[in-house]
């Protein structure tokens, strides 16, 4: 559910939403840390209806949700995927 990617791509998100999405409608969450061509952290949410949305990392609900998912990750979720692209 929770994936962290380190890439050398530029920013993926053109616009961001802060509108709440319940967990049950979320397929997975991608976190793209700042750096490597993008000056900001990006969060991409893949929804159960196959649509994708960029979420404002400052949105309270996504911060809370990621904290819950991190706490669960050791026992109930796959280990987050870390990918570093070789320059």
């Amino acid at each position: 559910v929770l994936e962290v990617y380190y890439t050398s791509l530029r920013c993926r998100c053109v616009q961001e939403s802060s509108v709440f999405i319940p967990r049950r409608f979320i397929d997975r969450i991608q976190i793209l840390p700042r750096g490597n061509g993008c000056p900001r952290k990006e969060i991409i949410v893949w929804k159960k209806n196959k649509s994708i949305v960029c979420v404002d990392p400052q949105a309270e609900w996504i911060q809370r949700m990621m904290e819950v998912l991190r706490k669960r990750s050791s026992s109930t979720l796959p280990v987050p995927v870390f990918k570093r692209k070789i320059p």
Partner: antibody
Framework: EVQLVESGGGLVQPGGSLRLSCAAS????????MAWVRQAPGKGLEWVAS????????YYRDSVKGRFTISRDNAKNSLYLQMNSLRAEDTAVYYC??????????????WGQGTLVTVSS | DIQMTQSPSSLSASVGDRVTITCKAS??????LTWYQQKPGKAPKRLIY???ILQTGVPSRFSGSGSGTEFTLTISSLQPEDFATYYC????????FGQGTKLEIK
């Protein structure tokens, strides 16, 4: 007091169409995700579809995808379910439900009385 | 898709009995489970949400427990108005209801 009142049910032939409505009152309608749940005669409950606050996001069970469309009109405090290509197995009481929600914790706390849809020739 | 297996499908009991209904999820749903009571011709009524939080106005004889894949609804001392059908609902990934448990008077 939260109230949900469904309407639009009735008898329809296989392949036909029907549009259900749900009138909401007693709460700020646009603050909630909403859902349709159905129950075939003598059977259990089955989630059909959900819609987000502004109607921009919709979700369906596999068996109704491409045939049913959930929508809402926040100005009218109304939820809709357009049902096309109806089949005998769609026969059920259809309930409108409010998805009280934050972080996925509370769900379907308020329900309407239901409206019966019968698909038969 | 997550499947919910509810048992028993029917249950006969007497007023004053302690009754337990079980719901098993096909995968981990943490505590994202709700219990409903439904009487004939009526809409479902939410009893318990988040596995063990009692809905306001629901008598304390109802309680819920569990986590992960196994959940229980317990009625500590059956009252005449408790004879109904009970459903569990997982809300971890979309929605899936259990098949229901019909609680009848013995």
């Amino acid at each position: 007091e939260v109230q949900l009142v469904e309407s639009g049910g009735g008898l329809v032939q296989p392949g036909g169409s029907l549009r259900l409505s749900c009138a909401a009152s007693g709460f700020t309608f646009s603050d909630y995700y909403m859902a349709w749940v159905r129950q075939a005669p003598g059977k259990g409950l089955e989630w059909v579809a959900s819609i987000n606050y502004d109607g921009g996001d919709t979700y369906y069970r596999d068996s109704v995808k491409g045939r049913f469309t959930i929508s809402r009109d926040n100005a009218k405090n109304s939820l809709y379910l357009q049902m096309n290509s109806l089949r005998a197995e769609d026969t059920a009481v259809y309930y409108c439900a409010r998805e009280e929600d934050y972080d996925g914790s509370y769900v379907m706390d308020a329900w309407g009385q239901g409206t019966l849809v019968t698909v038969s020739s | 898709d997550i499947q919910m297996t509810q048992s028993p499908s029917s249950l006969s009991a007497s007023v004053g009995d302690r009754v337990t209904i079980t719901c098993k999820a096909s995968q981990n749903i943490n505590k994202e489970l709700t219990w409903y009571q439904q009487k004939p011709g009526k809409a479902p009524k939410r009893l318990i949400y988040n596995t063990n939080i009692l809905q306001t106005g629901v008598p304390s004889r109802f309680s819920g427990s569990g986590s992960g894949t196994e959940f229980t609804l317990t009625i500590s001392s059956l009252q005449p108005e408790d004879f109904a059908t009970y459903y569990c609902l997982q809300q971890s990934s979309l929605y899936t209801f259990g098949q229901g448990t019909k609680l009848e008077i013995k």
